[in-house]
């Protein structure tokens, strides 16, 4: 069953620094920007297969969330559903469309600087780190008396990519989600058959950076479909 595949186990025995999930078909991907291991997902969906089945929100696209299609429906059957717009009812942040979050059961705008999400409990306060930023601006060594809530740095727990600093995205890492670097030119990427089909990956890679797209590496064109290596390339 899908669930038995999802209930994967310890990651081990792949090339260091990572291992692969025992009995797990998904790709094990290094969190390190330059050390990425390719891996196919044999449970990837077919292009025209709708709706897309899922087990977790992050398996869906950025404008979708994972839930049972019918109210009070079978919890075992879940699909990617369209995100909910402002003022619509919600149960968790992922149900709300980007730029919104779930507050008191309603999707509200996170544009005003009031959204800290649940990650306020693990506020990033970077120091001794040349790359630490404060919402995209360089952090000064002395801050004003106003408490700044800087965005999550690499390795920080997150709920969605907007929780992460510039150049990072929020991606699955085992049973949690953490901020990881957006991929640079030449780095291995995962090409999904349809938007959001992150399927059964234990590690999620971030998407390719601005001006880059995930394409088959030129010298891999002759390879079989299943083993084609995709990398981030200039448009």
């Amino acid at each position: 069953t899908l669930n038995s595949v999802l209930n994967s186990n310890a990651i081990k025995n792949l090339p260091p620094p990572l291992g692969g999930a025992a009995g797990h078909p998904g790709s094990a991907v290094s969190a390190a920007p330059g050390i990425l291991y390719p891996g196919g997902n044999k449970y990837q969906t077919i292009d025209n297969y709708q709706p897309y089945p899922c087990a977790e929100d992050e398996e869906c696209g950025t404008d979708e969330y994972c839930a049972s299609p019918t109210r009070g429906g079978d919890a075992g059957v879940q699909i990617c559903l369209a995100c909910r717009k402002r003022r619509k009812r919600c149960m968790r942040h992922a149900m709300c469309c980007p730029g919104n979050y779930c507050k008191n059961g309603i999707c509200v705008s996170s544009d005003q600087n009031n959204f800290r999400g649940e990650i306020e409990e693990t506020i990033t306060e970077s120091f001794g780190n040349d790359h630490s930023t404060l919402d995209g601006y360089s952090r000064r060594t002395t801050l004003s008396s106003k408490m700044y809530h800087s965005k999550g740095q690499e390795g920080s727990v997150c709920l969605r990519s907007s929780d992460c600093a510039t150049g990072l995205c929020c991606a699955r890492h085992f049973w949690s989600k953490i901020c990881k670097p957006v991929l640079k030119e030449g780095q291995v990427c995962t090409k999904h058959r349809r938007k959001g089909s992150h399927g059964l990956e234990i590690f999620q890679r971030c998407y390719c950076g601005e001006g880059l797209s995930c394409r088959i590496q030129k010298d891999h064109h002759q390879a079989s479909n299943s083993s084609r290596l995709h990398t981030c390339q200039r448009h």
Partner: antibody, heavy 115, light 108 residues
């Protein structure tokens, strides 16, 4: 504020079973992966198991694989650890904690496996 | 498995002194997926640092984390009486996530 409260520990004979619970409050439970960590008396910390926010993804240390089962009930904001075929070396304080790096911990519950 | 080795095993210092704790990984972590915890007798551990250098909520500024690759450091700039405890590092790059054996910071 975030609170995690474990229960269910106690004395059990080798080969026996126990079910630990961890009641969570103060945060949106289903948004977070949860973790069980244990600490044998006078020893260091050892990761036991982890489970994703929806419960679809579970992970175990080799030392407990096949004997322990992690699960969660998001409607009750509760995390569980079902421990079967217990051994003397499973004797430890068991902590539940939030996320892959453990930003919040419970107070722990002592499990003693002895005949 | 990635083995984390902490040194020294015990650090004997006086209040006001600077403490430098080391955590060395058996493999390059490449990414800053390392956390530090403080544990006092009879208590649960407490997260101090995550992402190698990010201070957790409510942790005093005297605690700082640094390092990359295989070598990571927790620094307590000026020890307070309440800082005497055992400190653990943890890597969460690969499974099993592993902890160091701990460094005990005791009063000299």
């Amino acid at each position: 504020q975030v609170q995690l409260v474990e229960s269910g520990g106690g004395l059990v004979q080798p080969g026996g079973s126990l079910r630990l619970s961890c009641a969570a409050s103060g945060f949106t439970f289903n948004n977070y992966g949860m973790t069980w960590v244990r600490q044998a008396p006078g020893k260091g910390l050892e990761w036991v198991s982890g489970i994703s926010g929806s419960g679809s993804y579970t992970y175990y240390a080799d030392s407990v694989k096949g004997r322990f089962t992690i699960s969660r009930d998001n409607s009750k904001n509760t995390l569980y650890l079902q421990m079967n075929s217990l051994r003397a070396e499973d004797t430890a304080v068991y902590y539940c904690a939030r996320t892959i790096y453990m930003d919040y911990w419970g107070q722990g519950t002592l499990v003693t496996v002895s005949s | 498995d990635i083995v984390l080795t902490q040194s020294p095993a015990t650090l004997s210092l006086s209040p006001g002194e600077r403490a430098t704790l080391s955590c060395r990984a058996s493999q390059n972590l490449f990414s800053p997926y390392l956390a530090w915890y403080q544990q006092k007798p009879g208590q649960a551990p407490r997260l101090l640092i995550y992402g190698a250098s990010n201070r957790a909520t409510g942790v005093p500024a005297r605690f700082s984390g640094s390092g990359s690759g295989t070598d990571f450091t927790l620094t307590i700039s000026s020890l307070e009486p309440e800082d005497f405890a055992v400190y653990y590092c943890q890597q969460y790059l690969s499974l099993p996530t592993t902890f160091g054996q701990g460094t005990k910071v005791e009063i000299k």
